[in-house]
């Protein structure tokens, strides 16, 4: 497994990374680490593992977290209730 | 070549569950995801959820939320959507559908034949 | 729920004109520079067909006719020289946001 650089798919990142769209470089995507308490998310982000490719630059958060809205456009990985 | 085959018409009595069946063929099943999409004779499309065929994580359409569940036999490729507390508004014709792994997209490249569900009394 | 409201309910055009279908989302569908939304066609006692998905990409074996712009909430399907099999209804269908919802569809008849 890749632990840090160019992916294509998940099962080429480390455990606790999906391959995420780079955020400076919208054609390449990186293993990115999934989304720590506190972090920026979509609620509909791909879970790990997918098997296509991503569209989005985030990971889903890590497990025990949950995607959360804390206001209108905004969603944060937050403890899940 | 990419197949989902569904279930048989079936009607039943308002209250009444029915459990519509989705056997794929084709592809590797548990690197798709599938979904459920309903349509009311004349009328559009709704979604009503979808369901991760590697591991069983569903996600529902909130409407349907206590009355629809959604599962997976991966022995034989096979979906499963199951509707209870049926009402006349739920007869349609429900169609299940392979997400295409576009991304986070969530498009649906390849559609079962449908199975109509009537609900009368 | 993001409500999708597609304009005209139904279009008649002669065959190789052009058909244009618009679709307004009743919020933005966009994150992160790219726009969720996808266009379907269904032809009568059969199921929908994808043709365009992620606004302005055409799925495989779609002909080129076919077309997808927009972003935000204002969306357009284009078919470039109508032809006699595209006569059918077509939808579009927000996923940027759960539940997943669709337009209420575009009628599309030969004049």
């Known amino acids: 497994a890749v632990i840090t650089g160019a992916c294509d798919k998940d099962s080429q990142c480390g455990g606790g990374m999906c391959c995420a769209v780079s955020i400076w470089v919208k054609s390449i995507r990186i293993c990115t680490p999934m989304g720590k308490l506190g972090d920026s998310c979509h609620p509909l982000t791909r879970k790990v593992p997918f098997f296509g490719r991503r569209m989005h630059h985030t990971c889903p958060c890590l497990p025990g977290l949950a995607c959360l809205r804390t206001s209108f456009n905004r969603f944060i990985c937050l403890a899940q209730k | 070549e990419v197949q989902l085959v569904q279930s048989g018409a079936e009607v039943k009595k308002p209250g009444a569950s029915v459990k519509v069946s989705c056997k794929a063929s084709g592809y590797s099943f548990t690197d798709y995801d599938m979904h459920w999409v309903r349509q009311a004779p004349g009328q559009g499309l709704e979604w009503i959820g979808y369901?991760?065929?590697?591991?069983?994580?569903?996600t529902y359409n909130q409407k349907f939320k206590g009355r629809v569940t959604i599962t997976v036999d991966k022995s034989t490729s096979t979906a499963y959507l199951e509707l209870s507390s049926l009402r006349s508004e739920d007869t349609a014709v429900y169609y299940c559908?392979?997400?295409?792994?576009?991304?986070?997209?969530?498009?649906?490249?390849?559609w079962g034949q449908g199975t109509l569900v009537t609900v009368s009394s | 729920d993001i409500v999708m409201t597609q304009s005209p309910d139904s279009l008649a055009v002669s065959l190789g004109e052009r058909a244009t279908i618009n679709c307004k989302a009743s919020q933005s569908v966009d994150y992160d520079s790219d726009s969720y939304m996808n266009w379907y066609q269904q032809k009568p006692g059969q199921p929908p067909k994808l043709l365009i998905y992620a606004a302005s990409n055409l799925e495989s074996g779609v002909p080129d006719r076919f077309s997808g712009s927009g972003s935000g909430t204002d969306f357009t399907l284009t078919i470039s020289s109508l032809q006699a099999e595209d006569v059918a209804v077509y939808y579009c269908q927000q996923i940027n946001e759960d539940p997943f919802t669709f337009g209420q569809g575009t009628k599309v008849e030969i004049k």
């Open positions: 559908a392979r997400d295409g792994n576009y991304g986070e997209a969530y498009a649906m490249d390849y």
């Open positions: 369901i991760s065929c590697y591991n069983g994580a569903t």
